[in-house]
């Protein structure tokens, strides 16, 4: 079965810095979402080879991509405290396949020592069960936000 390898599991960065999240699959994708989980989970990007990526307005101008949809590195720049959270890759194949998640801890510089990543991958056990056409290696899924962002794209 198709899997999404996502790295890193966790990263601690100061305000204003950048972070790389890599989503890798064995291929055969139509595209890939990066979704931020939390009380109001939301799509951050949708990336499809040969198509202009869709980016949520909160991240416009501070996201870069390298690689292809099968092995995509997403760089988020100028991180803010509010960007702290768990980010999950959702690969679109004939089913939905999810990565294990990346916990991004954005800290004020003086408090960096207080917030450290553990080696364990992020878990999201309180989240709802995935759709039936989904494949999840971990209890990790994504729900939608009540008021969707004004991000609209059409290839």
């Amino acid at each position: 079965a198709q899997e999404v390898q996502q790295s890193p599991h966790c990263t601690t960065v100061p305000v204003g810095a950048s972070v790389n999240i890599t989503c890798s699959t064995s291929g055969g994708l139509r595209g890939i979402y990066l979704r931020q989980l939390g009380p109001q989970p939301q799509d951050i990007i949708y990336y499809e080879d040969g198509v202009v990526p869709t980016t949520d307005r909160r991240f416009r101008g501070r996201i870069d991509f390298s690689g292809s949809q099968d092995n995509l590195t997403i760089t988020m720049h100028r991180l803010q405290l509010s960007d702290t959270g768990t980010y999950t890759c959702q690969a679109i194949t004939e089913v939905n396949v999810y990565g294990s998640g990346t916990l991004v801890l954005v800290t004020e510089e003086q408090s960096q020592g207080w917030h450290r990543c553990s080696d364990a991958p992020p878990r999201a056990s309180a989240l709802p069960a995935p759709p039936t056409g989904s494949a999840l290696p971990d209890p990790q899924t994504a729900s939608a936000l009540p008021d969707p962002p004004a991000a609209s794209a059409l290839p």
């Epitope: 931020q36 951050i44 869709t54 004939e94 729900s143 939608a144 059409l154």
Partner: antibody, heavy 117, light 107 residues
């Protein structure tokens, strides 16, 4: 059992507006993308709008800028706000659960929209 | 946009017949093709997804095949409840597009 029930259809004049609703039950609504599809009087099916589970919205050129899809996860309701309606928007409008970005596995019974002066 | 073509608009067959309905895409769609059944009362159901995967609860007499641009739906043993209109739909690329539909009637 998953159920989708559309409402809000009716007769509207060209240039007018209408808001359709789709009440969902029997599923974890917030976990799914959702779509609207319409069927013209000639029985052609046309995709109208989609919203991903994380809130991204997608439209064909024919309705972009006139229609807005949205969702209320607390109430398990999908919406389609339609404005600047034209006679060619006359159709039966169905909401559908979008299992995997375009794979529409459950459909409602539809609601009729007629645009006529 | 990808155009989906179902060459005939209606088809007549006898109960027990094997019926094949075709659909072609204006470009390759990598098997991202669904088949839907619409009953005379307007009810729409998914039959086949991703070219050949049978949706849950759909009788095994329905099957799908194809690749590239050419796809087909086969009903192996036509039953009275199969009287309906059948639509193909590609979901390889936005905008999602449907074929014009084939109305299946009993001889």
């Amino acid at each position: 059992e998953v159920q989708l029930v559309e409402s809000g259809g009716g007769l509207v004049k060209p240039g007018g507006s209408l808001k359709l609703s789709c009440a969902a039950s029997g599923l974890t609504f917030s976990s799914y993308a959702m779509s609207w599809v319409r069927q013209t009087p000639e029985k052609r099916l046309e995709w109208v709008a989609s919203i991903s589970s994380g809130g991204f919205t997608y439209y064909p050129d024919s309705v972009k800028g006139r229609f807005t899809i949205s969702r209320d996860n607390a109430r398990n309701i999908l919406y389609l706000q339609m404005s600047s309606l034209r006679s060619e928007d006359t159709a039966m409008y169905y909401c559908a659960r979008d299992e995997v970005r375009g794979y529409l596995d459950v459909w409602g019974a539809g609601t009729t929209v007629t645009v006529s002066s | 946009d990808i155009q989906m073509t179902q060459t005939t608009s209606s088809l007549s067959a006898s109960l027990g017949d094997r019926v094949t309905i075709s659909c072609s895409a204006s470009q390759g769609i990598s098997n991202y093709l669904n088949w839907y059944q619409q009953k005379p009362d307007g009810t729409v159901k998914l039959l086949i997804y991703y070219t050949s995967s049978l949706h849950s609860g759909v009788p095994s007499r329905f099957s799908g095949s194809g690749s590239g641009t050419d796809y087909s739906l086969t009903i192996s043993n036509l039953e009275p409840e199969d009287i309906a209109t059948y639509y193909c739909q590609q979901y390889s690329k936005l905008p999602y597009t449907f074929g014009g539909g084939i109305k299946l009637e009993i001889k």
